[in-house]
Each structure stands twice: as structure tokens, then as C-alpha cells.
């Protein structure tokens, strides 16, 4: 029978380095061959990605049916937009039945200001009790130097620079990996005594230091199963850390509440110069993808009876009769969804005298999500507060307008007596509350 095309089932992780990014794609277990990555050049032509130093792309096979794309920010397929490097790629795979699947398009996006290591998030730092802190650099050290290492700084004299609740990788000038792993890098926390290098288990590759909350591995690139790849002027050293699951065995079966942990580390050096690493990469496994399935997405536009949005006009209440300048309280909602990461963005809202949203005349109410500035009775955006009856405020948008009537274009200043219909174009985005999922309006 015919197969309906479907997007390839894959997980992926993007890591933005200072000079290039790496995009690792892993197809599902049933995949019989690794995915094919394609890209669009600036003429819109499709290219299957391969090792091409002229174009700044390298493809290598990863474990299982995975591939890793590395592309420089000056690659033929990378463009600059809004302080980011952007590269659209396609992931193409074949299922177990070898039927061709349609390409899943993905937009790879890396910030342009990645040359400096970000200072760690304060959440990584504040929650570590002093007794569990693992020194990252000897004291005394300045805050700037400490945070430049990707570590946490406190003004205390002892252990003023310590590792944060994450994975911190340093590639040393002398050719060593230094990998600090926090137990809180996973939830539930890692069993630290089970963390080990995947390819070697001898004592020379054991952790050099450990606390209740951290484990530190330090070993040269020439040991512990480190692999080396040389491409042109670049030498890439890679290794992998894994942890075992805590399994509870019972008389009728065994269970675990731990997810798998695999940490891929990579240090990249220039072969011709004796400089510091040009690339430091940590690849943690991406979190499991949410269970998704196709289904209807239902949106609703309602008019509330008052400013409390306590009750709404029903189908039988329309047309609602209002006096000129009376407020009208409008709500647009996503229905029947419990995903807190969904956000609702109002794009344009407008009014027409007929049910046809494209009919003329029209009056703008919201323009790009913001009140239309050409109106002397400005639309008011109304914040939606979380409540027991409204647990996902990002699924709702509210605004109020002041009642008006359209004017007859043929008879000067004569108000039309007919109804006014409201229309909105909306987007549903995720994750909610992030800049790309929120409209910020100028102060008027």
C-alpha cells in the first residue's frame, strides 16, 4: 500500500561554538541508514551537505545512525540576521520500510557574540552549599577571570572560584581534558559514583576529585579512549562520559527512575599553531522530546460581558448592542490545551461592517499585536493573570476597544447602522514568555 509521507523521527542538538557550530542528528531506533542533511544556498538551491572545506561544512558519522554537521559561520549556507548566524537545514531519513520521507526543515540559529564564554547562570551557582563546592581555579582570582572559565565566583577567601551546577569542560593548552560534572545536571540527580568514561575504565581514567555534588575528570588527549580526527588544519579530540541507571529490582520486575546520561565532549585545536583550543564543545543528550501527535488546534474569539471577564456573550446574544464609546472586552484563547509552553500572539485585529474579514471598509484595532496608534480611543491590552480557573495565562490574550460605528463613505459623516464584526489573525508559538513569543509594544 501507499505510505503517507511523514517527517523523520529524530532528535537533534545544536551547539554553538566561537567559530563554528555543530549540529548532531540522531534518527530513531528503527532507522536503517543515517539521516541525510540538506541545505539551501543563497539562491534557494538545494544541496546535500558533505565535507566541503570551500563551503565550510564537514559531515561525520556519529554513534548509531547519527550524523554530526559542523559548519563555520562563514559557510556558504550561513547568513547573518538579527545578531544571529542562521542556517536552514533539512533532515531527510528513510524508515524501516525504506519509504522516502519528506524533509523536516529546521532553522539553526547561533548568537553572533559567542567568542566570550558566558558567565554561568546565577541559578547554577547560588544553590551549591559551600561544603559541596569543587574548586575551579586556585584563589586568589578575579571575578572576571573566574567567570571567563565558565565558573562561579564568590567573595569568600577560600574556594572563591568553583564549578557551577552544570557540566564544565576545559581544554588545556597542554592537551588535557578537564571535565567537571554536577550531580544536578540531570533530574533526578546523577549517581556520581557511576559516572565514568565510556571507552576506558582503568584507574588512570577515574575521577581525580569528587565531592557530594561534583566529580572531576582530568586526563590527556592521548589516553582514556579519546579519539582524534584531523581535517585540514583542525584536530578534534573527543570522548564520552556515561552514567549507569539506578535500577530497583523486585520479585516481579525491575524499575528505574533515571534517564540515560551520555555526555560527549570535544576539543578542537589548530594543528599549525601552538595556540589555545579554537573550539570547546559539550554535547549533553537533549531532553526527551514531548509526545506529540497531529490534532486540531482550536482558537476562539469572545466578547466578555464586563471587565472581569467573568461571563461571555453566547451565540444567541449576538449582535450585542452597545452605546458609542462603551468599552468592549475581547478575549482570544487557545482551547483544550494544557501545554504551558504554548503562547498566543495576536498579529492583527480589525473590524469590518460585514462578516467577510477582507471586505471594505476596515478599521485597525491591533497592528502587529499593538494598539493602532491612529485611533484617538486607543485599544487597551489587558494582562491575563493566572488563576485556578485559568492556569495557562499564555493561552489567552485580552484587549478592550471603545464602541464605534463605521461612517458611510458616500454620505459625509453619516454613521452606518449595521453591525461591526471583529477579526484577529493570530499565531501560536512556543516556548511562551520568550522574546520571540511575546509582543512588546512601545510606550505611547
Amino acid at each position: 500500500g501507499q505510505h503517507k509521507p511523514e517527517a523523520p523521527d529524530y532528535s537533534s542538538v545544536l551547539h554553538c561554538g566561537p567559530w563554528s557550530f555543530q549540529f548532531a542528528v540522531n534518527l530513531n531506533q528503527e532507522a536503517t541508514s543515517p539521516p541525510v542533511l540538506i541545505a539551501w544556498d543563497n539562491q534557494g538551491l538545494l544541496h546535500e551537505l558533505q565535507n566541503d572545506s570551500d563551503c565550510g561544512t564537514w559531515i561525520r558519522k556519529g554513534p548509531g545512525s547519527s550524523v554530526v554537521l559542523e559548519a563555520t559561520y562563514s559557510s556558504c549556507y550561513v547568513t547573518e540576521w538579527d545578531s544571529h548566524y542562521i542556517m536552514p537545514v533539512g533532515v531527510e531519513g528513510a524508515g524501516a520500510a525504506e519509504h522516502k520521507v519528506v524533509t523536516e526543515r529546521k532553522l539553526l540559529k547561533c548568537p553572533m557574540d559567542l567568542l566570550a564564554r558566558d558567565a554561568p547562570d546565577t541559578d547554577w551557582c547560588d544553590s551549591i552549599p559551600a561544603r559541596d563546592r569543587l574548586p575551579c581555579a586556585p584563589s586568589p582570582i578575579s571575578r572576571g577571570d573566574c567567570e571567563g572559565l565558565g565558573c562561579c565566583y564568590s567573595s569568600e577567601e577560600v574556594n572563591s572560584c568553583y564549578y557551577g551546577n552544570t557540566v564544565t569542560l576545559h581544554c588545556t593548552r597542554e592537551g588535557h581534558f578537564s571535565i567537571a560534572v554536577s550531580r544536578n545536571v540531570t533530574s533526578p540527580p546523577l549517581l556520581l559514583d557511576s559516572v565514568r568514561l565510556a571507552l576506558r575504565n582503568d584507574s588512570a581514567c577515574n575521577p581525580v576529585m569528587a565531592t557530594q555534588a561534583f566529580v572531576l575528570f582530568q586526563f590527556p588527549f592521548t589516553s582514556c579512549g579519546t579519539t582524534r580526527q584531523i581535517t585540514g588544519d583542525r584536530a578534534v579530540y573527543e570522548n564520552e562520559l556515561v552514567a549507569t541507571r539506578d535500577v530497583k529490582n523486585g520479585s516481579r520486575g525491575s524499575v528505574t527512575r533515571d534517564s540515560i546520561f551520555r555526555l560527549h565532549v570535544s576539543c578542537s585545536y589548530s594543528v599549525s599553531s601552538n595556540s589555545l583550543p579554537i573550539n570547546v564543545q559539550v554535547f549533553t543528550l537533549p531532553p526527551p522530546f514531548p509526545e506529540t501527535q497531529p490534532g486540531p488546534l482550536t482558537l476562539e474569539l469572545q466578547i466578555a460581558k464586563d471587565k472581569n471577564y467573568g461571563s461571555y456573550y453566547g451565540v444567541g446574544d449576538y449582535p450585542v448592542v452597545k452605546l458609542l464609546r462603551d468599552p468592549i472586552y475581547v478575549e482570544v484563547s487557545i482551547l483544550h490545551r494544557t501545554d504551558p509552553y504554548l503562547g498566543l500572539l495576536l498579529q492583527q485585529c480589525w473590524a469590518t461592517p460585514s462578516t467577510d474579514p477582507l471586505s471594505q471598509p476596515q478599521w485597525p484595532i491591533l497592528v502587529k499585536g499593538c494598539p493602532y496608534i491612529g485611533d484617538n480611543y486607543q485599544t487597551q491590552l489587558i494582562p491575563v493573570q493566572k488563576a485556578l480557573d485559568l492556569p495557562f495565562p499564555s493561552h489567552h490574550q485580552r484587549f478592550s476597544i471603545f464602541t464605534f460605528s463605521f461612517v458611510n463613505p458616500t454620505v459625509e459623516k453619516q454613521a452606518l447602522r449595521g453591525p461591526v464584526h471583529l477579526h484577529c489573525s493570530v499565531s501560536v508559538c512556543q516556548p511562551a514568555e520568550t522574546p520571540s513569543c511575546v509582543v512588546t509594544c512601545p510606550d505611547l
Epitope: 460581558k305 464586563d306 472581569n308 471577564y309 467573568g310 461571563s311 494544557t338 501545554d339 504551558p340 493573570q385 493566572k386 488563576a387 485556578l388 480557573d389 485559568l390 492556569p391 495557562f392
Partner: antibody
Framework: QVTLKESGPGILKPSQTLSLTCSFS??????????VGWIRQPSGKGLEWLAH???????FYNPSLKSQLTVSKDTSRNQVFLKITSVDTADTATYYC???????????WGQGTTLTVSS | ENVLTQSPAIMSASPGEKVTMTCSAS?????MHWYQQKSSTSPKLWIY???KLASGVPGRFSASGSGNSYSLTISSMEAEDVATYYC?????????FGGGTKLEIK
Amino acid sequence: QVTLKESGPGILKPSQTLSLTCSFSGFSLSTSGMGVGWIRQPSGKGLEWLAHIWWDDDKFYNPSLKSQLTVSKDTSRNQVFLKITSVDTADTATYYCARSGVRRPFDYWGQGTTLTVSS
Amino acid sequence: ENVLTQSPAIMSASPGEKVTMTCSASSSVRYMHWYQQKSSTSPKLWIYDTSKLASGVPGRFSASGSGNSYSLTISSMEAEDVATYYCFQGSGYPLTFGGGTKLEIK
């Protein structure tokens, strides 16, 4: 099956701090839309909502008591906590914790724990 | 604060009699919820989203309303319905309960 159980000191003196624990099972506070609220009821009187904590750690308090209340949670241990500072005899009541689900306001309640404030 | 006023505060009904109690909100709410509390026990969710019966609630109970005005009705009073009934709004913080209607049997 969903159960909640409150525990507390039973008796306090005025100006002391009340610490209550709600231990629950049958649901997780990491599930989106879930929350736990605290409600109290003086003997023979009505119900008064005190505080509410959501899965995403959003917290809401009764404004008349806000300066005295702190709600927190330990998701991994399935526990929610309420602290009330400088209690008074008027705080003598039965204290309940209750679960709120998506479109299910306080659908499961604990058995309540009684507090007596007396000098 | 949205004040919920229940009336009557106390009422009694004979077995088989129809019972109606009301709850008035100072600000309109999207839904009203109702709890039943029998003496010396925890409250139970009885009706949610204005008119939906919680699990295990007998079909003789119904509720309705919108905006500021809500009511709970028992079509035929039974001895096991003796309790205090509280209305509750979860449409906005602070969450508020009504003062309760104590239902007794004649």
C-alpha cells in the same frame, strides 16, 4: 489514588512561627497545571484561603496575611510547606491542604491538622 | 477581593422537598464551584465549573448561574444531604469562599 496529609505542631504560643507540611501522593507537582493550596477553618466558622503554589513555582497569597505567609514545595519529595510567622490566638483553626488540577479547583483535600494558639 | 455572599445562612428542608441556595459575587466570575462539608470532615468538591457534578455526586444535585449570580439546587432533599455548602471562586486571586449555607433536615 490521590491523598494529601497535613502535619503541624498542634499547639503554639503567640508570636511563634507555624510550620506546616502537606505530604501528598497520587499526583506530581511537576505536572503542568497542578497546584496545591492551603485553606484554614476556625472551629464552627467558614473556610479561608491562605496560599497557593503552582507546578512552575508561582505563588499567591491572601493579601490580608501576605506579610506573614511563605509557601514552598519540594517536588521530588511530594511535599508542600506553609510558614506563618508571629501567630496569634485568631490563627487557631484547622489547616487543610488541597490539590488543584487543570479545571479542577481543590478537588482533593487532606484531613486537616488542628492548631491551637494559646499563651 | 471578590466577596461571595451565600443565602440563606441556615435552611431546613423536609425529605423530598426541593432546595435552592444562592451565591452572589461582588465581581463577576467565569465559573462558580461548590463544596460540601459534613461535620468534622474535610470539604469535598461537589460541583465545579458552575454546573458539572464531581465524581460520586448524586444526580439530584444541579447548579447554574453566570456573572455575579449562581445557585445550587437539590431536586429532592435526602437525609444524607445534611451539610454545609460553600461556594468558591477561582477566577482571580485572592481566592474566596462564601460564608456557607447550612442545610438541615426537618
